[in-house]
């Protein structure tokens, strides 16, 4: 039960994290105009990975995409790449983890296969989270550097948008979303890896013995965790050893229509 809960929670946390990484990547507020010198500006600038925006006090917002690839700073390109890699890995991880979830039955998939898939998705989530955290941190470092170098142009050549000495940029909301989302994805990945350990069958070479006891028949199976095939089978992962008796709450599993999809 604890393994299923850990796996399920890991999946949910990773799902939230990846949704956050996607949101952060799409957000326009990666850097926002520093209002320290002028808290009541009539023009507010903010920039994202894909476009820069200007919000006027009149309520009108104008956004312009960075319609160039070669003109963008290498660091910005690197951040874009890290975020996209994070999203792709996370999405694949989610897909893999759906099939690895213990509560979902797909054919007669062995627990060992589910364990491997859980580990794979866990690693993917960890790398995805690290990519997001790295991307956001690189951008944050870029901002800090530019903040103290008011004459340096952060986006030189970006469609004629040359930063003047007047406008300094500070951390935008997307950075915090990205950090939190990356952290959640990372935590989710770690939880999946922990869950994988509990899912992995402990190989013990016991001989299969079947005998008729007086009154009713009992089947014994080899191996560590009982191999299950049906929806109602051994949800508690009880270990069954030679000479042990089946407990009352265990259900004999029979092939069902759900086993062959």
């Amino acid at each position: 039960m604890a393994v299923t809960a850990c796996q399920g929670l890991g999946f949910v946390v990773s799902l939230i994290g990846i949704a956050g990484i996607i949101a952060a990547t799409c957000m326009d507020q990666w850097s926002t105009q520093d209002l320290y010198n002028n808290p009541v500006t009539a023009v507010f600038n903010y920039q994202g990975l894909w476009r820069s925006c200007v919000r006027e006090s009149s309520g009108f917002t104008e956004c312009r995409g960075y319609f160039t690839l070669l003109g963008l700073p290498a660091m910005l390109q690197a951040v874009r790449a890290l975020m996209i890699v994070g999203i792709v890995l996370g999405a694949i991880g989610l897909l893999v983890s759906i099939f690895a979830l213990k509560c979902i039955r797909i054919g007669s998939m062995e627990d060992s296969a589910k364990a491997n898939m859980t580990l794979t998705s866990g690693i993917m989530f960890i790398v995805s989270g690290l990519c997001a955290i790295a991307g956001v941190s690189v951008f944050a470092n870029m901002l800090v550097t530019n903040f103290w170098m008011s004459t340096a142009n952060m986006y030189t050549g970006m469609g004629g948008m040359v930063q003047t000495v007047q406008t300094r940029y500070t951390f935008g909301a997307a950075l915090f979303v990205g950090w939190v989302a990356g952290g959640l994805t990372l935590i989710g990945g770690v939880m999946m890896c922990i869950a994988c350990r509990g899912l992995a069958p402990e190989e013990t070479n016991y001989k299969a013995v079947s005998y008729h006891a007086s009154g009713h028949s009992v089947a014994y199976k080899p191996g560590g965790f009982k191999a299950s095939t049906g929806f109602g089978s051994n949800t508690k992962n009880k270990k069954i050893y030679d000479g042990g008796a089946r407990t009352e709450d265990e259900v004999q599993s029979y092939p069902s229509k759900h086993d062959y999809v």
Epitope: V40, A42, V43, S58, G59, R64
Partner: antibody, heavy 118, light 113 residues
């Protein structure tokens, strides 16, 4: 046709109070920020106060801060300027002006005159 | 606060003449985000409220005759009337639209000889 009509001006003694109104029509009032701008006799224009479309942002000129209060009623398409502790230097024509793209006043009312005198 | 200095304070011209008036800002009104200059020009005739002429330093408002032209850098702005007409007699104000408090120049009064 966009129209802004100010009212409520008049003669007030120093230290007195008065409330100006600006009735708007011809545009979606709740979508735009509105300002009060004044002009003293034979003088230039002076910005007084601003209120955003949803009243979430309000700014005042230092000369009126703490004495004037700008507000709006979007349901009635009306802007208000509550003035207290009036001084002789507040004597002016008060205009309400619609704030538009480019941070410009694209439409102005005809103005209402406030005279502060003993 | 941004201070706008208009010059000359008054201009006496003849009809058909080309006129230029200046507006200098104590700070740059150029916004780096969109490369727009947040300076606006208004025309005010006697007994009337001001009328919007030009915003973003050079964009003519709808209905404004093309004889009115705005130009300038981040701090120095010019309003040009290519051929003055009798109906252009008014006071012209420039306005800082970049930061609060919003400020106006003292105005340039255009008179006919």
């Amino acid at each position: 046709e966009v129209q802004l009509v100010e009212s409520g001006g008049g003669l007030v003694k120093p230290g007195g109070s008065l409330k100006l109104s600006c009735a708007a029509s011809g545009f979606t009032f709740s979508d735009y920020g509105i300002h009060w701008v004044r002009q003293a006799p034979e003088k230039g224009l002076e910005w007084v106060a601003y209120i955003s479309s949803g009243s979430s942002t309000i700014y005042y000129a230092d000369t009126v801060k703490g004495r004037f209060t700008i507000s709006r009623d979007n349901a009635k398409n009306t802007l208000f300027l509550q003035m207290t502790s009036l001084r002789s230097e507040d004597t002016a024509i008060y205009y309400c002006a619609k704030w538009d793209r480019g941070n410009c006043f694209d439409y102005w009312g005809q103005g209402t005159t406030l005279t502060v005198s003993s | 606060d941004i201070v706008l200095t208009q010059s000359p304070s008054s201009l006496t011209v003849t009809a058909g003449e080309k006129v230029t008036m200046s507006c200098k800002s104590s700070q740059s009104l150029l916004n780096s985000g969109n490369q727009k200059k947040y300076l606006t020009w208004y025309q005010q005739k006697v007994g009337q409220p001001p009328k919007l002429l030009i915003y973003w330093a050079s964009i003519r408002e709808c209905g404004v005759p093309d004889r009115f032209t705005g130009s300038g850098s981040g701090t120095d702005f010019i309003l040009t009337i290519s051929s003055v007409q009798a109906e252009d007699l008014a006071v012209y104000y420039c306005q800082n639209a970049y930061s609060y408090p919003l400020t106006f120049g003292a105005g340039t009064k255009l008179e006919l000889k």
